[in-house]
């Protein structure tokens, strides 16, 4: 019966970039300038997004596509198809509620956006800390301190409840 | 000291979600950041997702788009939404709570096994 009514429906034959257009007739209309639609049949034409402000256009409206923003240098993009901009920090901060923070000890950031995170907790892999942690940088851990005496053998303590010191990544 | 408590954990089928959630008790002062970790058999212990107390978030790259973590800062627990899974995802997942470098706890894990 769908399939029926569907070839019955002349607004089916409609293809995208236009729309059935109920005033005249449901003859098959272009979209209006700064409309699109991105399937065929549709009853009207959805507005193009425009990106302002803190947004910038990456991708420009056309009658069968939306236009596509993304943000100003200093922010970075959030959420589905760049919703939101937020702004960037620098690499050893993270954004907080009253702006760029540094790092606490402990912690790290290599990039520009997201939070601090804990260092690597070397001690969890039976390993040590052969390079130490940074604002920006995790530790880098070597070789367990078992495995640098001849004939040792290294055995992995379960990680405990509570874990002073490095945190494992 | 800090007791932490997961729980949701299961066996799914690919592309299943589950919710894990971790709650805090003890002696909490100012927990600064608490997140979810996860250690398969035979690999090195990694962090998935962490949220700070302003509420702003991490990620591994493996699960970006597929898991959500959130915080409840009044009831001191976190949850973490996992969506579409997959068979990599198989892991004993651990709450951590970091209040300092000298002070972080850990959760005894969930086992989340992804698996027809």
């Known amino acids: 019966f769908e399939r029926t009514r569907s070839l019955q429906d002349p607004c089916s034959n409609c293809p995208a970039g236009t729309f059935c257009d109920n005033n005249r007739n449901q003859i098959c209309s272009p979209c209006p300038p700064n409309s699109f639609s991105s399937a065929g049949g549709q009853r009207t034409c959805d507005i193009c997004r425009q990106c302002k402000g803190v947004f910038r256009t990456r991708k420009e409206c056309s009658s069968t596509s939306n236009a596509e923003c993304d943000c100003t240098p200093g922010f970075h993009c959030l959420g589905a198809g760049c919703s939101m901009c937020e702004q960037d920090c620098k690499q050893g901060q993270e954004l907080t509620k009253k702006g760029c923070k540094d790092c606490c000890f402990g912690t790290f950031n290599d990039q520009k956006r997201g939070i601090c995170r804990p260092w690597t907790n070397c001690s969890l892999d039976g390993k040590s800390v052969l390079v130490n942690g940074t604002k920006e940088r995790d530790v880098v851990c070597g070789p367990s301190p078992a495995d640098l005496s001849p004939g040792a053998s290294s055995v992995t303590p379960p990680a405990p409840a509570r874990e002073p010191g490095h945190s494992p990544q | 000291a800090v007791q932490l408590v997961e729980s949701g954990g299961g066996l799914v089928q690919p592309g299943g979600s589950l919710r894990l959630s971790c709650a805090a008790s003890g002696s909490i002062f100012s927990i600064n950041r608490m997140g979810w970790y996860r250690q398969a058999p035979g690999k090195q212990r990694e962090l998935v997702a962490m949220?700070?107390?302003?509420?702003?978030?991490y990620y591994v790259d493996s699960v970006k788009g597929r898991f959500t973590i959130s915080r409840d800062n009044a009831k001191i627990a976190i949850d973490l939404q996992t969506n579409s899974l997959k068979p990599e995802d198989t892991a004993v997942y651990y709450c951590?709570?970091?209040?300092?470098?000298?002070?972080?706890?850990w959760g005894k894990g969930t086992q989340v096994t992804v698996s027809s």
């Open positions: 949220i700070n107390s302003s509420g702003g978030t």
């Open positions: 951590h709570c970091w209040v300092s470098h000298e002070m972080n706890y």
